[in-house]
């Protein structure tokens, strides 16, 4: 309620705030780290749903600019107009700088030079040479081309001859062209074909002309297209008319406008064995597999969630030739992902699509914190342009105007917090009065007080104390003027539910607003004056008990209710025929009771069967809970289940299905919460798997429309989610789903960026949260390269990624020594000016004269380096002492290991962390 | 001067956890990895684990993952390391211990030591 | 991880002798660091990166060494040097240390 102010904060409240209207925090919105400023010469397409931002960028797209562009292939073959750029809509990022900037010439990366022959392509490094081109200005419409093999001649063309489409490390010559489609959309855009630049060994050629001739067989290398209209075919290369001896590595390479994606449908397949197609997701920081040739099955379709997409097709050489395909992509416009619905709240969205909005509303008693309008923001991946708001329970407030609401305790329905202090003051409009009713109190049994006073302040009569009442009152405390006061306190230790309160205002001469926990209720008058009725209703799974189901508003001098409300309860047992419904569990969502034994029967019209949707199940070990395919004990059993599970579904073969629940008379069922929540509809008898539903922050494929036996249902999620459970279901042959239905999980952490050789690493949280951060430092003797810290980032449109890549260790390089001069008499080996740390050198002396020091020393690894020892000389030798050989032409040195060739080298002071 | 001040003996018995403190002094206190090492009666010494008190990165030896934690509070500028389950085993004495540079392998500066007695 | 294996594992020496002590490492090694510690007190960095002396250690110590194999030398033996010597490596993770030389007074 917009009268509601609360007190923030928890903790002491040491006297009530009023506060105008609610409580509000600014927006702070996530920043993401994609830093990528895309760049394009293409058009704005104007597909269904486009954003309108985008129209005034349409009109000057179609005048000309004065800039050189790159020859592109014509729309048709004697058009003397080239193509120009069109400029760029600025559209905001999420750190408000434009995420489309200025015109350049390239798309993606293109490297400066021609690619080489034989460097395989890899989407991750370097994607091919690519130009969007814009339009041609309206005119009729115009078609690319179609190259068939039966239109080739048979002249032999010269042996530079170029396929239009030719990119990236093709061969310098392809024996055959493939077929290339590309359809006309409303405004005359055609999916138009990048110029093709080849490197020859002493030229570069770039052709502009459809070549229709081929050259001398040679043997196929990999061949590449772009793609780059809203929609087009792609083809398998034609069957060449000799079998070749060498595979195919063929990449069609897709891009659309940003802010779309491309998805592709599968319109034939038939592959030889040992033949690959992958289909991924370009254009974002990482390439996105998105299917393979397992999963590529007529009627599939694949969507990429990013503007960019490559299709690989590999083949070995096959004497049959290769496999065929076609596939056909079109644009669609991407959107934001459906925004978190706030605990104890709800979003209502326009649309997810840019120019969309979400509105968020919190449940009664609780204030959202946060921006209560999110707008969908255009964008390469569109984002929300604010955090997704929170609902909060605040301790305290003052509630000016009260009618009708509710006041809860903070963190309800969860437990309160300890050494918390908070004071309502709830004041009715002139000449009305209150009325309180008691939804829920659940105090821990210690010093933790609910008390309600009959006046505006902390001195009013108490009309309530939790202390002094063991049971609520059901009727609930009416005031005896405008205000009610309430003290909720708890102390230092235990903690609770707390409560739930729900107030009402009524003016003299009418009752007050009924209220029924887990029902709903009509009435005859709005404002409850006396002689209105009431009737009363129980949600779903819920049976009315104590009281009247209808009560009347009487007595003129005293409006009253001529009875006390009714409450709703799950209760055991129970006899269903309607269509759809639900079954709780005992006392749902409060803890079933031990020793209980229930019996539900659910009968439908007899052609028809029973979906039971097992909600919730968390129930004791020692619990049992049955599903019996018909209307008695007897049945088939459909399922039984003890302890808690997960999310599932059950059909019946029958229209009728018996549920029996039996609880461990000797365990206590509180340690499991709630019980059991199932949901039953009637289904339909018939040939097909029953429909599976959309899943939040994903979309599902199915290869075939009908979903008959052995359909298979391929479940994706948008990027920063993932799937959680079977992402693959097939309709079996008793036309039950093989999985349970999957969920689009958001990715809260990063992926374990690995130990590096030669470190250790230090890390703030086992599974890398968003904000963990991961160490690295070098053993000795190592370098460190790249970053040492490296941080879990959160990103709008993707999972959460390293602040970088993880670093390497490197053997430290030390300087060399400087040479050391021979010793007179004597000789040194090697004579070299330099030598390498950890080198050795020589040392022996002249005949006659003998060795005095180390024949023998090393280089020493260090900063700088040094020699291990002096350098020795020479001396002459006596007589006897040469006759006694001591003096020899080489001196050996004794035998040691290279420390270059054992030893890591390090000094600490070189390291950068 | 750095000076690593480290809490007093403390007797356990098995199965028990025993926290105990490394108060450093000196130097800025988040600007260096602190270290703990175990010295036994037999007098060995092994490196424990290392903790960044800026980030709150921990790195352990093998064989004390699962039974050290490393822990600091910035600001009383003290470093903490938890045992869990003791046995007879990790009665020694405990040093906590700084490296003289951010980029030095050795330890310069070495509190004066915790005995713990694991006794039943 | 590297096993450094200290020799002798006790030694003994008069006042002025001179005196080398060794540590072998299982696996090659950038540097190799020293530390001395007396009865009831922490260790102290002797020598670190295989020959440096911190300040306040006397010139009499002296270490060398590479690859797997380094010692620490006292040129001259004085009644003070009296303590137990451990070798410690962090050329890979985790550091390790031998096992100790004590080095009596004779």
């Known amino acids: 309620l917009s009268s509601e102010a609360p007190i923030t904060g928890e903790g002491q409240a040491t006297g009530i705030r009023e506060m105008d209207g609610e409580l509000t925090a600014a927006p702070t919105p996530e920043q993401s780290d994609r830093g990528v400023h895309f760049v394009t010469t293409a058009p704005t397409l104007k597909l269904l749903n486009h954003h309108p931002l985008l129209e005034e960028f349409l009109q000057e797209g179609l005048e000309g600019r004065e800039e050189a562009p790159r020859p592109a292939l014509p729309f048709q073959p004697d058009s003397p107009t080239p193509f120009t750029p069109s400029p760029l809509p600025r559209l905001t990022n999420q750190d408000n700088r434009p995420v489309f900037t200025s015109p350049t010439p390239a798309v993606a990366a293109a490297p400066t030079q021609p690619h080489s022959r034989k460097k395989p392509w890899n989407p991750e490094s370097e994607p091919p040479e690519l130009y969007i081109t814009s339009p041609l200005p309206p005119g009729p419409s115009m078609a690319v081309p179609t190259l068939h093999p039966e239109d080739r001649p048979s002249t032999t063309p010269p042996s530079q001859a170029w396929t239009p489409t030719q990119e990236g490390p093709g061969d310098m010559g392809r024996p055959w062209v493939p077929e290339i489609m590309s359809k006309t959309t409303g405004l005359g855009i055609e999916g138009t074909i990048a110029t093709s630049t080849a490197s020859g060994d002493d030229e570069e050629t770039t052709t502009t002309t459809i070549i229709t001739t081929v050259t001398t067989i040679q043997p196929p290398g990999p061949c590449s297209w772009n793609f780059s209209g809203p929609e087009g075919s792609l083809d398998s290369p034609a069957v060449p008319s000799v079998p070749s001896d060498v595979g195919l590595d063929c990449l069609y390479y897709i891009s659309v406008y940003p802010g779309y994606g491309v998805e592709i449908k599968v319109k034939n397949i038939s592959l030889q064995e040992g033949e690959t197609i992958t289909v991924e997701g370009l254009g974002g920081p990482d390439p996105l597999p998105l299917a393979n040739q397992s999963f590529l099955l007529r009627g599939q379709v694949i969507r990429s969630p990013t503007h960019q997409a490559a299709v690989r097709f590999q083949s070995l050489p096959l004497p049959a030739g290769p496999g065929t395909f076609h596939f056909h992509y079109q644009a669609y416009l991407l959107s934001c992902h459906f925004p978190r619905r706030p605990a104890y709240g709800d979003v209502t969205v326009t649309s997810l699509h840019p120019g969309g909005s979400a509105r968020f509303h919190c449940a009664t008693g609780y204030q959202l914190k946060g921006a209560r309008f999110l707008t969908c923001l255009n964008a390469t991946q569109p984002f929300w342009d604010s955090q997704e708001p929170v609902c909060i329970a605040a301790c305290g407030g003052v509630i000016r105007n009260a009618t009708t609401g509710r006041i809860v305790s903070p963190g309800f329905p969860g437990n309160y917090s300890n050494n918390l202090t908070c004071h309502w003051l709830l004041e009715a409009p002139e000449s009305q009065r209150l009325h309180l009713h008691f939804e829920k109190v659940s105090l821990a049994e210690d010093d933790d007080r609910l008390i309600i006073r009959n006046g505006n302040n902390v001195e009013a009569p108490p009309v309530y104390d939790s202390y002094e009442v063991e049971y609520l009152p059901i009727e609930g405390l009416l005031s005896s003027g405008r205000h009610f006061f309430v003290e909720f306190s708890t102390d230092s230790s235990g903690a609770a539910a707390g409560m739930a309160l729900r107030y009402e205002a009524f003016q003299q001469g009418h009752c007050y607003e009924p209220f029924v926990k887990y029902g709903n209720f009509s009435s005859s008058a709005p404002s409850y004056p006396v002689g209105t009725t009431v009737e009363f209703s129980c949600d779903p799974g819920y049976t009315l008990e104590q009281g009247s189901i209808i009560i009347e508003c009487v007595d003129l001098r005293d409006p009253q209710w001529n009875e006390t409300e009714p409450a709703c309860r799950a209760v055991c047992s129970g006899e269903i025929t309607d269509s759809a419904g639900v079954v709780l569990s005992p006392n749902w969502p409060e803890p079933y009771g031990r020793g209980q034994d229930c019996i539900w029967g659910v009968h439908v019209e007899e052609d028809k069967r029973i979906m039971l949707d097992i909600r919730v199940l968390r129930i004791g070990s020692g619990d049992v809970l049955t599903f019996y395919d018909g209307d008695d004990l007897t049945a088939r059993v459909l399922g039984q289940y003890s302890g808690p599970r997960g999310h599932f579904k059950l059909f019946t073969s029958m229209a009728d299905v018996t549920i029996q629940f039996q609880s461990d008379p000797g365990t206590s069922a509180l340690g499991y919460q709630q019980g059991f929540v199932i949901h039953f509809f009637e289904v339909p008898r018939n040939d097909t798997c029953p429909e599976l539903p959309e899943i939040p922050n994903g979309w599902k494929n199915p290869s075939q429309p009908e979903l008959v036996h052995g359909t298979v249902v391929t479940y994706q999620c948008y990027p920063g989610y993932q799937v959680v459970g079977s992402s693959i279901l097939m309709c079996q042959w008793d036309l039950s789903w093989s999985e349970d239905l999957p969920s689009c999980q958001r990715v809260t952490s990063c992926h374990d960026p690995g130990d590096v050789e030669h470190s250790r690493r230090l890390i703030s949280s086992l599974k890398f949260p968003v904000g963990a951060t991961v160490q690295y430092i070098c053993d000795q003797g190592f370098v460190l390269t790249g970053s040492a810290i490296l941080t879990c980032h959160d990103r709008q449109a993707g999972s959460p990624k390293w602040s970088d890549r993880a670093p390497k260790c490197l053997l430290e390089q030390f300087k060399p020594c400087h040479g050391l001069s021979a010793p007179e008499n004597g000789a040194r080996s090697p004579e070299k000016r330099l030598h390498p740390a950890g080198a050795t050198i020589h040392f022996s002396c002249a005949p006659g004269y003998v060795l005095k020091g180390q024949a023998s020393i090393k280089c020493v690894p260090g900063h700088p380096s040094h020699w291990s020892d002096p350098p020795p000389i020479c001396r002459a030798a006596s007589l006897d002492g040469f006759y006694n050989g001591r003096s020899l032409d080489v001196a050996k040195a004794p035998a040691t290991s290279s420390a270059l060739d054992a030893a890591h080298h390090h000094h600490h002071h070189h390291h950068h962390h | 001067e750095v000076q690593l001040q480290q809490s007093g003996p403390e007797v356990m018995k098995p199965g028990a956890s025993v926290k105990m403190s490394c108060k450093a002094s000196g130097y800025t206190f988040t600007d260096y990895n602190m270290h703990w090492v175990k010295q036994n009666q037999g007098k060995s010494l092994e490196w424990i684990g290392e903790i960044n008190p800026n980030i709150g990165g921990t790195g352990y030896n093998q064989k004390f993952k699962g039974k050290a934690t490393l822990t600091v509070h910035k600001s009383s500028s003290t470093a903490y390391m938890e045992l869990r389950s003791l046995t007879s085993e990790d009665s020694a004495v405990y040093y906590c211990?700084?490296?003289?540079?951010?980029?030095?392998?050795?330890?310069?500066?070495w509190g004066q030591g915790t005995l713990v007695t694991v006794s039943a | 991880q590297i096993v450094l294996t200290q020799s002798p594992a006790i030694m003994s020496a008069s006042p002025g002798e001179k005196v080398t002590m060794t540590c072998s490492a299982s696996s090659s090694v950038s540097y190799m660091h020293w530390y001395q510690q007396k009865s009831g007190t922490s260790p102290k960095r002797w020598i670190y990166d295989t020959s440096k002396l911190p300040s306040g250690v006397p010139a009499r110590f002296s270490g060398s060494g590479s690859g797997t194999s380094y010692s620490l030398t006292i040129s001259s033996m004085e009644a003070e040097d009296a303590a137990t010597y451990y070798c410690q490596q962090w050329s890979s993770t985790p550091p390790t240390f031998g096992a100790g030389t004590k080095l009596e007074l004779k």
């Open positions: 211990a700084r490296t003289y540079s951010y980029y030095s392998y050795e330890f310069a500066y």
